[in-house]
């Protein structure tokens, strides 16, 4: 869907240069953003999100793919989101992360605080479109769940279903199969606490077609799991191997957009963990 042009996160084809090849990347409703909790608007009409079928993703293996920009898991269209204005069916999930020894890695930030990684679960409006690519060109054609990932004490079994297969897709364009697992466990427990705004794809072609849901609560993986994510994959097909790291876009200006919260803040400071 990116027109076959070459883009990277840094260097001559890096994100500063994206708008030259992908004009939409320079528009005024781009993602990711820094969500300042004291500036969001509480919307009492935002319901808790209902991920249907996430706990039963069928019996067919799921395709895991290193596309040189991220590691992506294809999802069956039996998974869909309730609690949104349209029926959005799942298409894929992927991750963004930093590099060893450096802070950051998530795309979105909450109160200017980044985490080590971020999971995106991408859905498209199946009432209106036949495929993800068709929907990606239209306003609110996509709905993406953003889950900030921090480091905790214990291994996250759900994320291990993905991370344990990374060695099979070390190089760009490699694919493998992953047995289906409970995808609901990838999400934070409190699905009722999230932020909602209109934004874009965070990679070229940066279409401004995304209804974003960024969860307030974080998911946790172990340090060992994070290091596996940071040190296993390569963005090149063969030698010389270039490690696939720091695949996150810089924060984009909010401009005139509103960010809505599904819950009332106890205070303006961001808290983690379960209540």
């Amino acid at each position: 869907a990116d027109g076959g042009q070459h883009w990277t996160y840094e260097g001559p084809h890096g994100q500063d240069h994206w708008p030259a090849s992908y004009p939409e990347c320079g528009n005024n409703a781009q993602s990711p953003i820094d969500i300042q909790t004291d500036s969001v608007t509480f919307d009492p009409d935002l319901p808790a999100l209902q991920p249907h079928g996430y706990d039963q993703p069928g019996t067919e293996p799921l395709d895991l793919h290193n596309n040189g920009h991220t590691v992506q898991l294809s999802l069956p269209s039996t998974l869909y989101l309730g609690g949104l204005p349209r029926k959005y069916v799942a298409a894929q999930l992927h991750l963004h992360w930093g590099q060893k020894g450096s802070p950051g890695g998530s795309e979105h930030q909450i109160n200017s605080e980044a985490t080590f990684a971020e999971l995106h679960i991408v859905h498209y409006d199946s009432d209106s479109y036949d495929s993800l690519s068709e929907a990606a060109e239209r306003p609110q054609g996509l709905a993406v769940l953003g889950i900030l990932i921090e480091v905790g004490e214990t291994k996250n079994i759900a994320y291990e279903h993905i991370l344990s297969h990374l060695h099979e897709v070390r190089h760009k364009d490699q694919k493998t199969s992953v047995p289906p697992f409970n995808l609901r466990e990838l999400l934070p427990k409190q699905l009722g606490q999230y932020f909602r705004y209109n934004g874009s794809l965070t990679t070229p072609p940066c279409y401004q077609s995304v209804l974003w849901t960024v969860f307030y609560r974080r998911s946790q993986i172990s340090m060992e799991q994070l290091e596996k994510l940071q040190g296993t994959l390569f963005s090149t097909e063969e030698e010389p191997s270039k490690l696939l790291v720091q695949n996150y876009r810089a924060l984009q200006p909010l401009n005139q957009r509103m960010v809505f919260a599904s819950f009332i803040q106890a205070g303006s400071s961001y808290t983690t963990g379960e209540m």
Epitope: G3, P85, K87, D125, D127, Y129, D130, S131, S133, E134
Partner: antibody, heavy 115, light 112 residues
Framework: QVKLEQSGPELKKPGETVKISCKAS????????MHWVKQAPGKGLKWMGW????????TYADDFKGRFAFSLETSASIAYLQINNLKNEDTATYFC????????WGQGTTLTVSS | DIVMTQSTFSNPVTLGTSASISCRSS???????????LYWYLQKPGQSPQLLIY???NLASGVPDRFSSSGSGTDFTLRISRVEAEDVGVYYC?????????FGGGTKLEIK
């Protein structure tokens, strides 16, 4: 740029079979569904159905069930429309068109069925 | 099936003036999600159709803003604010609410 290039005009006899091709370029075939539309001479547009280019699963409108078949040659980025046991009333121009919104169209393939 | 009805010819219009083309559906095209699944296409003489409007009121890429569309759930109007010679052709409305997707019979825009 996105382009859908259809095969040339066809002259067939009743009872024969025709296979019309639609070559997609400027995008990945499997990223968008492909729809087919019929236009009889001097008439309007009629939606025939569509094919899921990822799975290969076709969906046909009732008037196009039976003798009509959509297929793909994904490696060559080509979608096909095959019509079996041709009848005179199949004489028309057939268009392939990308996506449910039909934002891009092929130039059309004129099929003449005559004895 | 949803039937889309259009008049065969528009009233002849003078270049530079506005024109309206109407379309009616046998069932409301307003989905519960708030989207109205009504589309407009223009087929110029000897050419393939081209998308003008999607989801009732959204201008397709590359279409001049002289074109606009509005309507209720069943009655729709395509407006051309300043008709140019290149606007001549047959205008089709279509619905994508339900299978089978259906087109109107087309309205031919004529110039005085």
């Amino acid at each position: 740029q996105v382009k859908l290039e259809q095969s040339g005009p066809e002259l067939k006899k009743p009872g024969e079979t025709v296979k019309i091709s639609c070559k997609a370029s400027g995008y990945t075939l499997t990223d968008y569904s492909m729809h087919w539309v019929k236009q009889a001479p001097g008439k309007g547009l009629k939606w025939m159905g569509w094919i899921n280019t990822e799975t290969g699963e076709p969906t046909y409108a009732d008037d196009f069930k039976g003798r009509f078949a959509f297929s793909l040659e994904t490696s060559a980025s080509i979608a096909y429309l095959q019509i079996n046991n041709l009848k005179n009333e199949d004489t028309a121009t057939y268009f392939c068109t990308r996506g449910r919104e039909r934002g891009f169209w092929g130039q059309g393939t004129t099929l003449t069925v005559s004895s | 099936d949803i039937v889309m009805t259009q008049s065969t010819f528009s009233n002849p219009v003078t270049l530079g003036t506005s024109a309206s083309i109407s379309c009616r559906s046998s069932k409301s095209l307003l989905h519960s999600n708030g989207i109205t699944y009504l589309y407009w296409y223009l087929q110029k003489p000897g050419q393939s159709p081209q998308l003008l409007i999607y989801q009732m009121s959204n201008l397709a890429s590359g279409v001049p803003d002289r074109f606009s569309s509005s309507g209720s759930g069943t009655d729709f109007t395509l407006r051309i604010s300043r008709v140019e010679a290149e606007d001549v052709g047959v205008y089709y409305c279509a619905q994508n609410l339900e299978l089978p997707y259906t087109f109107g019979g087309g309205t031919k825009l004529e110039i005085k």
